[in-house]
């Protein structure tokens, strides 16, 4: 896979943020924006949360999220997973790309139960034209928005 | 805003490393070494712990911070803020690029007095020729410095 | 150092991901996948542990691990530490590039004693050719492998 | 620099309360430390009492927890060590001691004189 | 209760000599543990933190090592304000312990 960079070629980049809308309760992947802000796409583009490769090659993908809570009630999971998922016509099922586990209920105490931790994913991956990307979070109930710097999703060719 | 990697051109790129001259006391952002160990500029400038930008374009900038300390005195509901903060000269406030909140002191246990939490940030922003980019962590005190392996700042052209 | 990109020059990146084979328990690096899955070598070598340099030059590094545990046995040391070192033939120990330090065992809760974290660190570091980039964890029995998603190592020229 | 002054009386009865006071010049006691309590019996080595933040968070050797109370005055920048049922065991030089809690310095950095507190009747 | 135990309890030496005081944890405490130096009728004096950092102002022929369980105190070149109690303290776990001393004096 000989990829190249040729001069006065854009190189594709993108980094999404988190909005109120990005919580959907359906089970699908977070949402994101792509446009208001600190939010661009540059030779990628959006798909229903899914960043979507137009030029292949290796990219580095990365992802933060902001959990939080008030103590951990028990119906919430005790153990958060994030995690970047390709999504690819040459196959059903999202796969895996990097994913994290975190226990951050551990970090509320019985004098404190307000509590915060952060995921941050990233790393290089190769990605086909028309792939896509997505992030989860189970459970992402303790995902923590507010205003686009703290839950992120993004992308850059290498 | 079209970006172009011509060839023969020097990529943007610096990293960072923390000193014992880093925690400033005076509620101003973190401070850096340029030059010693692995810390270098190159493309970039460095202004009172800011890295300042020469070159218009899409960055990938980054810091960690290792957090610590023994037991929890300021009381286990205290969170840590570690953020990337934009300074404009087209606007008189900084602007939050990346930040992250984490709660460190539920680490501390009956059976480990001592603890340890780290913060990495890391994402793409749009940086105009000028602009600067500064770290903060509140409540500072509690980032180990000494040796510039553990909290550091960097970034590079994409 | 002036470092260029070339058109038409392929710009050096791995990935290397965690297999059941990349703890040795012998107090080396942590060991890791080179081809199969998600793993890959473009323009970097890989000897024993280490991504091999063959071009000098300005370098993201990174890597995750995956922590875990079920309470947190005495025998364990309480701290994990998590870093990339440089070998290099100009020197005889190893050099300290990027490390964390965590306490997860404060993870740990009354009702919940398996415990997970993540470590993620990524910064650039100049890198000769021939020199070696290896991971390091300890405590390594406290790392999670499973499926390469979760623990990985990796590295692009900038 | 930050000092440290122990005050108290130097002789208890048996049965009766202890009551130190230490006080912290050149620093605010509203810092990222701990402010502790060690004590030395005569000829002996160094016991540790208790711990306290300028938050108001104690901490106890276990084997004295019953009878130990410890508490901080913001407002005079000092704390204070209360024991009570004390013996003639009690009887030792008490220290106090500022531990820098933060990330970069660890450790009892800073030490009082040391009062000698006498237990008897 | 983490228990330390130093050894020896007492050595003699002479002023040049280099001196090693041990003092081992009864489990592991990472690197948290500080080396302090006691004079008669004097408080302790912080000489090393987190196992092998030197205090400000400590002269640089005390060094420390160790981390776990085994830890060591060297003086490089014994002066004659050297001589004095040495302990050892954990304080990775409550309730924070010391050692029970190593008395240097001299030969």
């Known amino acids: 896979l000989i990829q190249e960079r040729r001069s006065h070629e854009v190189n594709p980049a993108a980094h999404l943020t988190g909005a109120n809308s990005s919580l959907t309760g359906s089970g699908g992947p977070l949402l994101w924006e792509t446009q208001l802000g600190l939010a661009f796409l540059r030779g990628l583009s959006y798909h229903d949360g899914a960043l979507v490769v137009t030029k292949a090659g290796y990219y580095y993908i990365y992802s933060k999220v902001q959990l939080g809570g008030v103590g951990c009630p028990l119906g919430l999971a005790s153990t958060i997973t994030h995690g970047l998922y390709k999504r690819t016509p040459r196959y059903p099922e999202e796969l895996e790309l990097l994913v994290s586990q975190q226990s951050p209920c551990g970090r509320a105490t019985s004098s404190s139960r307000v509590w915060w931790d952060s995921s941050f994913l990233g790393g290089v991956v190769h990605l086909e034209a028309g792939e896509k990307v997505v992030v989860r979070v189970l459970d992402e109930r303790l995902v923590r928005l507010r205003d686009g710097t703290r839950s992120y999703f993004g992308a850059f060719m290498v | 805003l079209i970006q172009e990697r011509r060839s023969h051109e020097v990529n943007p790129a610096a990293h960072l490393t923390g000193a014992n001259s880093s925690l400033t006391g005076s509620g101003g952002p973190l401070l850096w070494e340029t030059q010693l160990g692995l810390a270098f500029l190159r493309g970039l400038s460095y202004h009172d712990g800011a890295l300042v930008v020469t070159k218009a374009g899409y960055y990938y900038i980054y810091s960690k911070v290792q957090l610590g300390g023994v037991g929890c005195p300021l009381g286990l509901a205290s969170t840590i803020t570690h953020g990337l903060y934009k300074r404009t000269p087209r606007y008189p406030e900084e602007l939050e690029l990346l930040v992250s909140q984490q709660s460190p002191c539920g680490r501390a246990t009956s059976s480990s007095r001592v603890w340890w939490d780290s913060s990495f940030l890391g994402g793409v922003v749009h940086l105009e020729a000028g602009e600067k980019v500064v770290v903060r962590v509140l409540d500072e005190r509690l980032v180990r410095l000494r040796d510039g392996t553990r909290s550091y700042f960097g970034a590079f052209m994409v | 150092l002036i470092q260029e990109r070339r058109s038409h020059e392929v710009n050096p990146a791995a990935h290397l991901t965690g297999a059941n084979s990349s703890l040795t328990g012998s107090g080396g690096p942590l060991l890791w996948e080179t081809q199969l899955g998600l793993a890959f070598l473009r323009g970097l070598s890989y000897h024993d542990g280490a991504l091999v340099v063959t071009k000098a030059g300005y370098y993201y590094i990174y890597s995750k691990v995956q922590l875990g545990g079920v309470g947190c046995p005495l025998g364990l040391a309480s701290t994990i530490t998590h870093g990339l070192y440089k070998r290099t033939p100009r020197y005889p120990e190893e050099l300290e590039l990027l490390v964390s330090q965590q306490s997860p065992c404060g993870r740990a809760t009354s009702s919940s004693r398996v415990w997970w974290d993540s470590s993620f660190l990524g910064g650039v570091v100049h890198l000769e050719a021939g020199e070696k980039v290896v991971v390091r964890v300890l405590d390594e029995r406290l790392v999670r492998l499973r499926d390469g998603t979760r623990s990985y190592f990796g590295a692009f020229m900038v | 620099q930050v000092q440290l002054q122990e005050s108290g009386p130097g002789l208890v009865k048996p049965s009766g309360t202890l009551s130190l006071t230490c006080a912290v010049s050149?620093?605010?006691?509203?810092?990222?430390?701990?402010w502790n309590w060690v004590r030395q019996p005569p000829g002996k080595g160094l016991e540790w009492i208790g711990e306290?933040?300028?938050?108001?968070?104690?901490n106890y050797n276990p084997s004295l927890k019953s009878r130990v109370t410890m508490s901080v005055d913001k407002a005079k920048n000092q704390f204070s060590l209360k024991l009570n049922s004390v013996t003639a065991a009690d009887t030792a030089v008490y220290y106090c001691?500022?531990?820098?809690?933060?990330?970069?310095?660890?450790?009892?950095?800073?030490w009082g004189q040391g009062t000698t507190v006498t237990v008897s009747s | 209760a983490i228990q330390l135990t130093q050894s020896p309890s007492s050595l003699s030496a002479s002023v040049g000599d280099r001196v090693t005081i041990t003092c081992r944890a009864s489990q592991g405490i990472s690197s948290a543990l500080a080396w302090f130096q006691q004079k008669p009728g004097k408080p302790p004096k912080l000489l090393i933190f987190d196992a092998s950092d030197l205090e400000s102002g400590v002269s640089s022929r005390f060094s420390g090592s160790g981390s776990g369980t085994d830890f060591t105190l060297t003086i490089s070149s014994l002066q004659p304000g050297d001589f004095a109690t040495y302990y050892c303290q954990q304080f990775n776990s409550y309730p924070i312990t010391f050692g029970q001393g190593t008395r240097l004096e001299i030969k």
């Open positions: 050149g620093g605010s006691i509203s810092s990222i430390n701990w």
């Open positions: 306290v933040s300028h938050s108001g968070i104690t």
């Open positions: 001691a500022r531990e820098r809690a933060v990330a970069d310095y660890h450790g009892m950095d800073v």
